[in-house]
C-alpha cells in the first residue's frame, strides 16, 4: 500500500549522483527504512537502541547511506535512464511504538543535464 | 472504548513535588507510547515529554528535563509523570496522551481528562 | 524553537458562515495537526498530517498548508464548532502548540 507521495524534495542531484532522501520523525529511536525501485529493494538501513542507549546500525542490502536525527540519505551514482523509475521509502517504525509502516515515495526523472558532472 | 483516566487534583507547596498518574484501558498498554502536555491557566498547550511502553525511552523538552520524571506500570497500565522543585508556575492543568502516527509525523490521538495542579504557600 | 503564531487570536462568526483558522510557523514544518478544545475539555485530534481528518470528525473541516503557513477551515459553522483550536507541529524539537485561535459565536 502506497501511503502517499513525499511531502519534501525526495531527490538531490550532484555530480552524476542522486541523494534520495527518506525522511522519518525525529521522535521515533528504533526503525528500519528501505529504499524500493519499483518492487525491488535496493537498500535498507536498520536502527537499534540496546541497554545503556546504544545505538547499533545494520543493512542487510547495503547502499552508501547517511543517517540523521530525522532522515536517511541513500546514495546512488553514475547515473543512466535506466535508474528512472519510481522509489519508495518503506518505513517501520518499531519504537516508540505504535509499530508503523509508511511507504512515501515519488518518481526520479533522468535528464541527460543530469548524467554527468552537474551540481544542482 | 479507548480510555486514559488520571489522577484527581493535587494542591502543593513550592519546592515539593507532585506524581501524576494515567490509567490506560481498552487497548494494548505497551503497543503505544504515552506523551504528557501541560496547559497554564489562560495559557496554550506546551509539551513536556515522551515515554515508550515498550522500551521505557523517554524524551524530554529540555525545559523540563532534569525536574520531569516519566515511568510506567505495565502491570497496571499506568503512567506516571512526577515533577519536582515546584513553583507557582508550575500551577497548570497536566494531560497524558497516546502517541500515533500518520504517514508523515506523530500525534496525541486521545488524551486524558486532564489532572489540575496548583501550586501555592 | 519554532514558534506557531495562529491568527486570529479571536474570530467571532455566526452559525453557517465559513471560517478560516491560520497557523504560521517561525521555519518550515514538514506537517501540521490541528486540536479543538471546549472549556473545561482535553483537546480533541481534529485534523493530522496537515489535511487528513481524524476518526470521527466531520467533513465540514479540513487542513491545507505547507512549509510555513497552514491553514484549518470549517465550512459551514454548526453550533458546536465554538471553540478553541490549537495546531501543533511535531516535526521541530521541542515540539509545539500554537497560542489558539478562540472561535466564537456573533
Known amino acids: 500500500e502506497i501511503n502517499g507521495s513525499a511531502n519534501y524534495e525526495m531527490f538531490i542531484f550532484h555530480n552524476g549522483g542522486v541523494q534520495i532522501l527518506c525522511k522519518y520523525p525525529d521522535i521515533v529511536q528504533q526503525f528500519k527504512m528501505q529504499l524500493l525501485k519499483g518492487g525491488q529493494i535496493l537498500c535498507d538501513l536498520t536502527k537499534t537502541k540496546g541497554s545503556g542507549n546504544t545505538v547499533s546500525i545494520k543493512s542487510l542490502k547495503f547502499c552508501h547511506s547517511q543517517l540523521s536525527n530525522n532522515s536517511v540519505s541513500f546514495f546512488l551514482y553514475n547515473l543512466d535512464h535506466s535508474h528512472a523509475n519510481y522509489y519508495f521509502c518503506n518505513l517501520s517504525i518499531f519504537d516508540p511504538p505504535p509499530f508503523k509502516v509508511t511507504l512515501t515515495g515519488g518518481y526520479l526523472h533522468i535528464y541527460e543535464s543530469q548524467l554527468c558532472c552537474q551540481l544542482k | 472504548q479507548v480510555q486514559l483516566v488520571q489522577s484527581g487534583a493535587e494542591v502543593k507547596k513550592p519546592g515539593s513535588s507532585v506524581k501524576v498518574s494515567c490509567k490506560a484501558s481498552?487497548?494494548?498498554?505497551?503497543?503505544?507510547?504515552m506523551h504528557w502536555v501541560r496547559q497554564a491557566p489562560g495559557q496554550g498547550l506546551e509539551w513536556i515529554g515522551l515515554?515508550?511502553?515498550?522500551?521505557?525511552?523517554?524524551n524530554y523538552n529540555q525545559k523540563f528535563q532534569g525536574r520531569a520524571t516519566m515511568t510506567v506500570d505495565k502491570s497496571t497500565s499506568t503512567a506516571y509523570m512526577e515533577l519536582s522543585s515546584l513553583r507557582s508556575e508550575d500551577t497548570a492543568v497536566y494531560y497524558c496522551g497516546r502517541n500515533n502516527y500518520g504517514n508523515y509525523g506523530w500525534y496525541f490521538d486521545v488524551w486524558g481528562q486532564g489532572t489540575t495542579v496548583t501550586v501555592s504557600s | 524553537e519554532i514558534v506557531l503564531t495562529q491568527s486570529p487570536a479571536t474570530l467571532s462568526l455566526s452559525p453557517g458562515e465559513r471560517a478560516t483558522l491560520s497557523c504560521s510557523a517561525s521555519?518550515?514544518?514538514?506537517?501540521m495537526h490541528w486540536y479543538q478544545q471546549k472549556p473545561g475539555q482535553a483537546p480533541r485530534l481534529l485534523i493530522y498530517?496537515?489535511?487528513k481528518l481524524a476518526s470521527g470528525i466531520p467533513a465540514r473541516f479540513s487542513g491545507s498548508g505547507s512549509g510555513t503557513d497552514y491553514t484549518l477551515t470549517i465550512s459551514s459553522l454548526e453550533p458546536e464548532d465554538f471553540a478553541v483550536y490549537y495546531c501543533f507541529q511535531g516535526s521541530g524539537y521541542p515540539y509545539t502548540f500554537g497560542q489558539g485561535t478562540k472561535l466564537e459565536i456573533k
Open positions: 521555519s518550515s514544518v514538514s506537517y
Open positions: 481498552g487497548y494494548t498498554f505497551t503497543d503505544y507510547a
Open positions: 498530517d496537515t489535511s
Open positions: 515515554i515508550s511502553i515498550y522500551s521505557d525511552h523517554t
